[in-house]
């Protein structure tokens, strides 16, 4: 769809003749007549097959036309078209006389054709002007003429409609070739495509308008390239969506079981070397002159009795001193100056001869030690107690305190935490150093098997077109993250965007 | 061939929220090709454009309707739907679904045969 | 809010044309769709795009829009064609309907 303009600029009849050349009374009261027609080798006569049109009086003999197209007049006159441009045109422009007001061509004697000017060739769309001259015996004819395309038609032959918009079925202008151009932000075919914000992750992000960036199930953050973790995890992170993966020193579902108390307590007090024994559990080796579970008391060097035969100890600022009684000697009072006849083993200990009666030892009875048997046996020498028991020399009965998981005369033994049968649903227990596990059947999960859960949502394989499939333990549902080129729950659609209907 | 199918109830009391659903079958609603919409019109009068979707889930409303509109979208069941609340005599009409072209003029191809409500207590 | 005048009514004889306008601020700027809807049935699609036919709509159907007017043209009307016909274009983001044109058959 187009428009053929053309544009009278100046008439010339000096003598003010018709074409018969008989003259005008008074003067040539001028109007034309324009027939525009397919290509024709020779111009005939026959219908105006691209349209016709015709002027007012414009002037009488000779004149010039002026230019009305701002002030909505008639030149340049307008032959629209509703076709594609053939690129090629034939013009008759007649100019003739009125005598009177009816300008019809049935209102006019024949001979008042002034003159008839035929010209064709080839003229192609464009905004520039052809002038054109035109000259007979009596007549001169200046006018200049184009083809341009009509509002929203665009191309060399003003076949291809186009009309901007943004709006949800496009975001785009025309290019001069009738071709889209899209709008900052916008791609596709109709530019209905926006761009996300740049870095936005090509699978696990999208967006429905320019310059953001939407996640999809699964993903976090500004660019949607990071994975959200199994819902309740707490010290573990995630390269797929709903992972929990334990951080160094955790373990559990959860990641919320501490397998390095150590580290994260720093439970051995005075420097003591602590080594992990267990969930939540520890060992602290003390450093000398230190005792208790985490190393908390100090030891006097005289708590452990370094002086034998019933020597005093008395502690001295770089150590301890031993003082003997009457018939010992040495550091610990370790050496012995009295020999079986002095009767030196007490408690009901026997004395034995040694070295030829130069020297004895003594054999003790039952809960007595010593060279002598002077000394009640104390009990916590040996470290009896197991399991970072505390040991307690005094007390008729109990010897050792215990930690919390453990019992026995030694703390030798596990409370059984399994005892109470806590795991629900048919759930296996477990015991630990400290605590218990449950190992639960399908279908059932959680610290005590508690939590009915479905079986895997991706067992059943969901996902179409090689989509990764996530469960969401959270919700029992499973999640598609679809590969590039395929959308829906279950990635089974490819994207596309074919024209529904064809050009 | 394409063919939508509205559904709902036929009667809404004042002040309650109308809900219809249109079942798309013989095409895919996850089509870029198309949005679906919901156009209406009450008896004796002309059509009315209430709103459109995306398959993505990309919603555009009459601003006449706006507040009170939601439609969405079901790519599992192949359905969209219509939910108007709020609603007063003035909602009383036939409810069309149909199938509107993604692209250039998004002329409506398809319609749903429609379904009457009424609003009345 | 954008608005789409059309003439309540249009009467034609069996076998001539008749035009059915379709009045809006800029419309030739924008794609024109019409519908005809008979008593009773659904609206259909008779053109889209300005000018375009959907398959199965008669030839005698045919569109233009320029300026502010498209027009709707029925040449060699039949008593089928007798029924109600809008028009549709869409304003920014918003479907617009024309008021309705009764096509009656003489």
């Known amino acids: 769809s187009g428009v053929f303009q053309l544009q009278l600029q100046e008439f010339i009849n000096e003598r003010g003749v018709l074409a018969s050349g008989r003259p005008c009374e008074p003067g040539c009261r001028t109007f034309f007549r324009v027939c525009l027609k397919h290509f024709q080798a020779v111009v005939s006569p026959g219908p105006c097959t691209f349209g016709t049109v015709s002027t007012p009086v414009l002037g009488t003999n000779s004149f010039a036309v002026r230019d009305d197209s701002s002030g909505g007049g008639r030149n340049p006159l307008q032959l629209p078209f509703n076709f594609t441009w053939p690129g090629t045109f034939s013009l008759i422009i007649e100019a003739w006389h009125a005598p009177g007001d009816d300008l019809r061509p049935e209102a006019l004697p024949p001979d008042a054709l002034i003159s008839k000017i035929a010209i064709q060739g080839s003229l192609a769309v464009g905004q520039n002007w052809l002038l054109d001259e035109q000259t007979s015996t009596l007549t001169r004819l200046r006018y200049s003429y184009r083809v341009i395309c009509s509002d929203n038609y665009y191309g060399d032959n003003c076949s291809r409609l186009c009309k901007k918009r943004n709006d949800h079925f496009g975001h785009y202008v025309c290019q001069p070739d009738g071709n889209l151009s899209c709008l900052p932000g916008w791609t596709g075919e109709y530019c209905q495509q926006p761009i996300c914000l740049s870095g936005c992750h090509e699978q696990n992000g999208y967006c429905s308008k320019p310059a953001e960036c939407l996640c999809r199930p699964g993903w976090q953050g500004r660019l949607c390239n990071e994975c959200i973790p199994h819902n309740g995890c707490r010290h573990g992170t995630c390269s797929t969506p709903w992972q929990c993966t334990c951080d160094e020193g955790w373990g559990g579902l959860f990641c919320d079981q501490d397998l390095n108390y150590c580290t994260h307590h720093s439970p051995c007090k005075n420097g003591a070397t602590c080594s992990n024994s267990g969930q939540r559990s520890y060992t602290c080796t003390c450093r000398p002159g230190y005792t208790g579970v985490d190393c908390e008391l100090e030891l006097s060097e005289c708590d452990s009795n370094p002086c034998r035969n019933g020597g005093s100890c008395k502690d001295q600022e770089d150590g301890y001193h031993c003082l003997c009684p009457p018939g010992y000697y040495g550091l610990h009072c370790e050496h012995s100056t009295l020999s079986c006849a002095d009767s030196p083993c007490f408690n009901g200990g026997s004395c034995r001869e040694r070295n030829q009666g130069a020297n004895y030892a003594c054999e003790c009875p039952p809960n007595f030690t010593g060279s002598n048997c002077e000394k009640k046996v104390d009990r916590c020498t040996s470290n009896p107690c197991a399991n970072g028991g505390q040991c307690l020399n005094r007390g008729p009965s109990r010897m050792c305190r215990c930690r919390p998981g453990f019992t026995g005369t030694y703390c030798e033994l596990h409370v059984s935490d399994c005892a109470r049968n806590p795991c629900a649903h048919g759930g296996t227990c477990h015991d630990l150093e400290n605590g218990l596990m449950c190992t639960c059947p399908a279908g059932f999960s959680g610290r005590r098997c508690e939590v009915r859960t479905s079986i895997d949502a991706c067992a059943s394989s969901p996902c179409f077109n090689r989509a990764t499939c996530y469960t969401d333990l959270s919700t029992d549902t499973f999640v598609c993250n679809c590969p590039y080129g395929f959308v829906g729950s279950r990635c089974e659609f490819p994207v596309g965007l074919p024209p529904s209907f064809p050009w | 061939e394409v063919q939508l199918q509205e559904s709902g109830p036929g009667l809404v009391k004042p002040s309650e929220t109308l809900s219809l659903t249109c079942t798309v079958s013989g095409g895919s609603i996850s089509s870029s090709s198309y949005y679906w919409g919901w156009i209406r019109q009450p008896p004796g009068k002309g059509l009315e454009w209430i709103g459109d979707?995306?398959?993505?889930?990309?919603?555009y409303y009459n601003p006449s309707l706006k507040s009170r509109v939601t439609i969405s979208v079901d790519t599992s069941k192949n359905q969209f739907s219509l939910k108007l609340s709020s609603v007063t005599a003035a909602d009383t009409a036939v409810y069309y679904c149909a199938r509107e072209e993604a692209i250039l003029g998004g002329g409506s191809d398809y319609w749903g045969q429609g379904t009457l409500v009424t609003v009345s207590s | 809010s954008y608005e789409l005048t059309q003439p309540p009514s249009v009467s034609v004889s069996p076998g001539q044309t008749a035009s059915i306008t379709c009045s809006g601020q800029?419309?030739?700027?924008?794609?024109a769709s019409w519908y005809q809807q008979k008593p009773g049935q659904s609206p259909v699609l008779v053109i889209y795009e300005d000018s375009k036919r959907p398959s199965g709509i008669p030839e005698r159907f045919s569109g233009s829009n320029s300026g502010d007017t498209a027009t709707l043209t029925i040449s060699g009307t039949q008593p089928m064609d007798e029924a109600d016909y809008y028009c549709q274009a869409w304003d920014r983001d918003t479907g617009v309907f024309g008021y309705g044109t009764k096509v009656t058959v003489l």
């Open positions: 800029r419309l030739g700027d924008k794609y």
């Open positions: 979707i995306y398959y993505t889930g990309s919603t």
